[in-house]
């Protein structure tokens, strides 16, 4: 059985202040079944972005269909991008369960945010 | 704004339990990552535990097997089970809430909690 | 586990006078360190994160510096409230998050 890759393409995503930014996300399988989460940091104070099971998220948007039999793409928008929003982001894989259980996360992608061009 | 209000704290013999919680408002908690961290009194701080948004848990070594951190996000809480408790884990104990970068942004005001026979 | 230290333990200043305290760490940590202020009796207050940014509501009279191992919190023409305890606090590794044993800023 191959072992299921979580990938994020880019290293870093640059944009200004006020754009979108598209933090790009795949996965190599759709085995297991479980919910893909983002993230913003690493470790205790990792702050979620983004849940399409729950949550009320109203700066992001999914890319493609996350509801769609066999997608997988997890890509997302995040839109009006403050310098705040900077900093890394993890595409985070889990397997279904009572709580889900965390498998596999994405290299991440720093974005950093230059300043609105006058 | 955040507010996060600490309650449990208490006089407990050693080798006795006591649970802690600490109840966020000002934000939302399911999303973040929260702390908690300890003051032995006239000493310096010392982060102790953490729960993050995914609910992960981080414990420092001398709690470890000793102390859980949980949290209910329907009840905006955050909760330390202490058991087996040492006289050196006399202090006053402050729940805080914990950036994406991992440094504490917002802390309660602490609750005592005294270890002693 | 990144052991910091903070010189100097205890600091006599007068009013309006700078201050500088320093934070160094037992290894490099990227410029991920946070300052907080302790008055007595109150919950310590994020001054500082990621080396030179100053938290929001912070005044301009407190700025931090440094790279790599060594770390200093500056206070410009120090007023009466900012009498406390100063800690520091690395954010670059979580296993575990560690303070500093704090510096103690007291009226000369």
């Known amino acids: 059985e191959e072992e299921l890759q979580v990938i994020q393409p880019e290293k870093s995503v640059s944009v200004a202040a006020g754009d979108s930014a598209t933090l790009n996300c795949t996965v190599s399988s759709l085995i297991p079944v479980g919910p893909i989460q983002w993230f913003r940091g690493a470790g205790p104070g990792r702050e979620l972005i983004y849940n399409l099971k729950e949550g009320h998220f109203p700066r992001v948007t999914a890319v493609s269909d996350p509801t769609k039999r066999n997608n997988m793409d997890f890509s997302i928008r995040i839109s009006n991008i403050t310098p705040a929003d900077a900093g890394t982001y993890y595409c985070v894989k889990f397997r279904k369960g009572s709580p889900d259980v965390e498998l596999k996360s994405g290299a991440g992608t720093e974005l950093s945010v230059r300043a609105k061009p006058s | 704004d955040v507010q996060l209000v600490e309650s449990g704290g208490g006089l407990v013999q050693p080798g006795g339990s006591l649970r802690l919680s600490c109840t966020a408002s000002g934000f939302t908690f399911r999303n973040y990552g929260m702390s908690w961290v300890r003051q032995a009194p006239g000493e310096g701080l010392e982060w102790v535990s953490a729960s993050s948004g995914s609910g992960s848990t981080y414990y420092t070594d001398s709690v470890k097997g000793r102390f859980t951190i949980s949290r209910d996000n329907s009840k905006n809480t955050l909760y330390l089970q202490m058991n087996s408790l040492r006289a050196e884990d006399t202090a006053i104990y402050y729940c805080a809430k914990v950036t994406w970068n991992n440094f504490f942004d917002y802390w309660g005001l602490g609750t005592l909690v005294t270890v002693s026979s | 586990e990144i052991v910091l230290t903070q010189s100097p333990g205890t600091l006599s200043v007068s009013p309006g006078e700078r201050v500088t305290l320093t934070c160094r760490a037992s290894?490099?940590?990227?410029?991920?360190i946070a300052w907080y202020q302790q008055k007595p009796g109150q919950a310590p207050r994020l001054l500082i994160y990621d080396a030179s940014s100053r938290a929001t509501g912070i005044p301009g009279r407190f700025s931090g510096s440094g790279s790599g191992t060594e770390f200093t919190l500056t206070i410009t023409s120090l007023q009466s409230e900012d009498f406390a305890v100063y800690y520091c606090q690395q954010h670059y590794d979580w296993s575990p998050l560690t303070f500093g044993g704090g510096t103690k800023v007291e009226i000369k």
């Open positions: 290894q490099g940590i990227a410029g991920k």
